[in-house]
């Protein structure tokens, strides 16, 4: 518990919520998830919990799109009270709010074992690429709430009926998208500051699905009713989501390191990277796969596998050091992840207290650099950018809710991997 401060509010998925405000979270590709209630607590933390449905005492309970729990027909709210949610139109078909459907042709790099799952939520269509589990039966069947076919008796598949497990799956190297970004695993060489890597770690995606289905990669594509197209850019056969950056690959020149392209809805916008005129060292060196020269030195040795420019720039974005400290005693783990910033000059420490796999407490402290420097237990694990930190904190908000009501073993370790800046194949960002 923390003292309430007058300017306290909660940030959740880029939205501000007032203390005491309640809402259903928006989770792609499902849209509004009515079976989870979130509340902004007095200390600025978002607390979410699954709705526990009471047992219904009738033969054929009815599912209503905007209500989580099934109801007996005689206890349904009158029609005029009904929340009228916007329907969606896609490819000439109208879908009701909450309806799931399958789409074709959205993802160019779809594998044979993948299908495109879409849902209609509040007038927007959310689509995701889903990797289907291997089928062990001869005659799989289609089910209404999944684009994957399943073997009979494989359990109920809608997320309302599952135990609310977090959707975890191995990394998919093809799909390269934002927070529910598909590859978290840093290159094996990235051993820094004693942070152990988790070879068998499951990647946490923050999307919610049935635990039976924990085997695919969800990639968000939003198809707005007006535009009828995905918020993706296609460059050189690769798909990039809105906000993602890359170096263009031109046939005549190969990868152009000194140009950075960004996907803006569906348009790619490219700009030249400007290198600094002055470097903090006498002899900056040109390194393959990097646009600007780099000062040789200790930092590069400390953090192998990461492509930083001078002054710690990564693909044109300033980087900041990330530290970690972990204490384990009597079945309780306290994990602290700290980001050091220049403006304002402070260290933001994210404190996780986990007992027997259940999150007991999560909070954020902001401490002065001088106070932080005195703390002996923190090890420098990587440097990261503000945009990666934002992705990290959004993911953190999600897992801090999920892990407070169920056992989480590797979710936080997996999430920390988001902070590692990957030098992708051939050195492009």
């Amino acid at each position: 518990e923390q003292v309430k401060h007058s300017e306290t509010y909660c940030m959740f998925q880029d939205k501000k919520y007032r203390v005491g405000e309640r809402w259903h979270p928006y989770l792609e590709p499902y849209g509004l998830v009515y079976c989870v209630n979130c509340i902004c607590s007095e200390n600025g933390n978002v607390l979410c919990s699954r709705v526990r449905c009471p047992n219904v005492h009738c033969l054929s309970p009815v599912h209503i799109p905007h209500l989580c729990c099934p109801r007996c027909p005689d206890s349904l709210p009158p029609v005029n009270n009904k929340v009228t949610s916007k329907s969606c139109e896609y490819n000439g078909t109208t879908y009701q709010h909450g309806e799931l459907f399958v789409a074709e042709g959205l993802f160019q790099n779809r594998q044979p074992n993948q299908c495109t799952q879409c849902s209609c939520s509040e007038g927007n269509v959310y689509c995701g690429l889903k990797t289907c589990p291997k089928l062990t039966c001869a005659f799989p069947v289609s089910v209404p709430d999944s684009c994957c076919r399943v073997c009979r008796g494989d359990g109920e598949l809608s997320w309302e009926h599952s135990d609310g497990d977090i959707f975890r799956q191995p990394a998919n190297r093809e799909a390269r998208h934002s927070y529910h970004r598909s590859h978290y695993d840093p290159p094996p060489s990235r051993q820094a500051g004693g942070l152990s890597r988790f070879p068998g770690a499951r990647s946490h995606r923050g999307a919610l699905m049935d635990s039976q289905q924990a085997s695919g990669t969800i990639v968000q594509i939003v198809i707005n009713n007006k535009h009828k197209h995905g918020q993706v850019c296609v460059s050189n056969g690769k798909t990039y989501s809105h906000g993602e950056s890359w170096h263009p690959n031109l046939r005549a020149f190969g990868i152009v390191e000194c140009v950075l392209c960004t996907c803006n809805v569906t348009k790619q916008e490219c700009k030249k990277i400007h290198c600094p005129n002055r470097y903090p060292c006498k002899y900056p060196q040109k390194i393959d796969g990097k646009c600007c020269k780099v000062c040789p030195g200790k930092k590069a040795k400390e953090l192998p596998g990461q492509s930083f420019d001078n002054k710690g720039y990564f693909c044109g974005e300033e980087t900041m050091p990330v530290y970690e400290s972990v204490f384990m005693e009597d079945g309780e783990t306290t994990r602290k992840i700290a980001l050091e910033t220049e403006r304002p000059p402070q260290v933001e420490v994210h404190v996780w207290t986990i007992r027997k796999g259940i999150l007991q407490h999560f909070h954020i402290e902001k401490i002065s650099k001088r106070m932080f420097e005195e703390l002996p237990h923190f090890k420098l694990v990587t440097r990261t950018t503000l945009s990666q930190w934002k992705i990290f904190t959004e993911g953190e908000a999600q897992i801090s809710q999920m892990c407070s009501s169920r056992v989480c073993r590797t979710e936080l370790e997996d999430l920390v991997k988001v902070l590692y800046l990957e030098r992708s194949e051939k050195g492009h960002c």
Epitope: N43, F327, T353, Q360, E365, I367, R370, M371
Partner: antibody, heavy 119, light 107 residues
């Protein structure tokens, strides 16, 4: 709500030791540093040091390094401060204090324990 | 150690009056400053943290300002229950250090 319940008043002889306790409730004890502050009669506040209950890490004001020893018992969510080799100058009210979001901004205070050193 | 010089050491003020107490640090403390109010026989109570952020439940007549080395606490319109001793605390660096206090009394 957060509460820090401190042990009762102590009267000790010069050269003796006392161990003060501060029982925390209403929050996750291991998640926040516990600070200790003293106040001599009619004087201002003086910071003694803090302990991080999760790791047992302590940081002392150099002035109290040989005087105070900070420890915690996680199982009972209690912080302790042992004062050794007491002198008359150690007569004071001792407070434990913790914070919410900002280290040093001691938002929650115990009610204080009065220590009187008298022969 | 960072020295916090608080002034005045004591002052008399009338109800409804605007009161300002200042604290000067011996070096830049990056706004890591808190203000406390203490009444006789009671524990200190936090009013302000990070130089200008009001703790919830503290009346809005209290405000904090300043940066670098110079900070101040202002009570816009003094009320009877505001009487007591006010302390500033820097927590930019250990050892944490308090100002000597300002005793506020009714004129």
């Amino acid at each position: 709500q957060v509460q820090l319940q401190q042990s009762g008043a102590e009267v000790a002889k010069p050269g003796a030791s006392v161990k003060l306790s501060c029982k925390a409730s209403g929050y996750t004890f291991t998640s926040y540093w516990m600070h200790w502050v003293n106040q001599r009669p009619g004087q201002g506040l003086e910071w003694i040091g803090y302990i991080d209950p999760s790791s047992g890490y302590t940081k002392y004001n150099q002035k109290f390094k040989d005087k105070a020893t900070l420890t915690v018992d996680k199982s009972s969510s209690t912080a302790y401060m042992q004062l050794s080799s007491l002198t008359y100058e150690d007569s004071a009210v001792y407070y434990c204090a913790t914070y919410s979001n900002y280290v040093g901004a001691m938002d929650y205070w115990g009610q204080g324990t009065s220590v009187t050193v008298s022969s | 150690d960072i020295k916090m010089t608080q002034s005045p050491s004591s002052m008399y003020a009338s109800l409804g009056e605007r009161v300002t107490i200042t604290c000067k640090a011996s070096q830049d403390i990056n706004s890591y400053l808190s203000w406390f109010q203490q009444k006789p026989g009671k524990s200190p109570k936090t009013l302000i943290y990070r130089a200008n952020r009001l703790v919830d439940g503290v009346p809005s007549r209290f405000s904090g300002s300043g940066s670098g080395q110079d900070y101040s606490l202002t009570i816009s319109s003094l009320e009877y229950e505001d009487m007591g001793i006010y302390y500033c605390l820097q927590y930019d660096e250990s050892p944490l250090t308090f100002g000597a206090g300002t005793k506020l009394e009714l004129k």
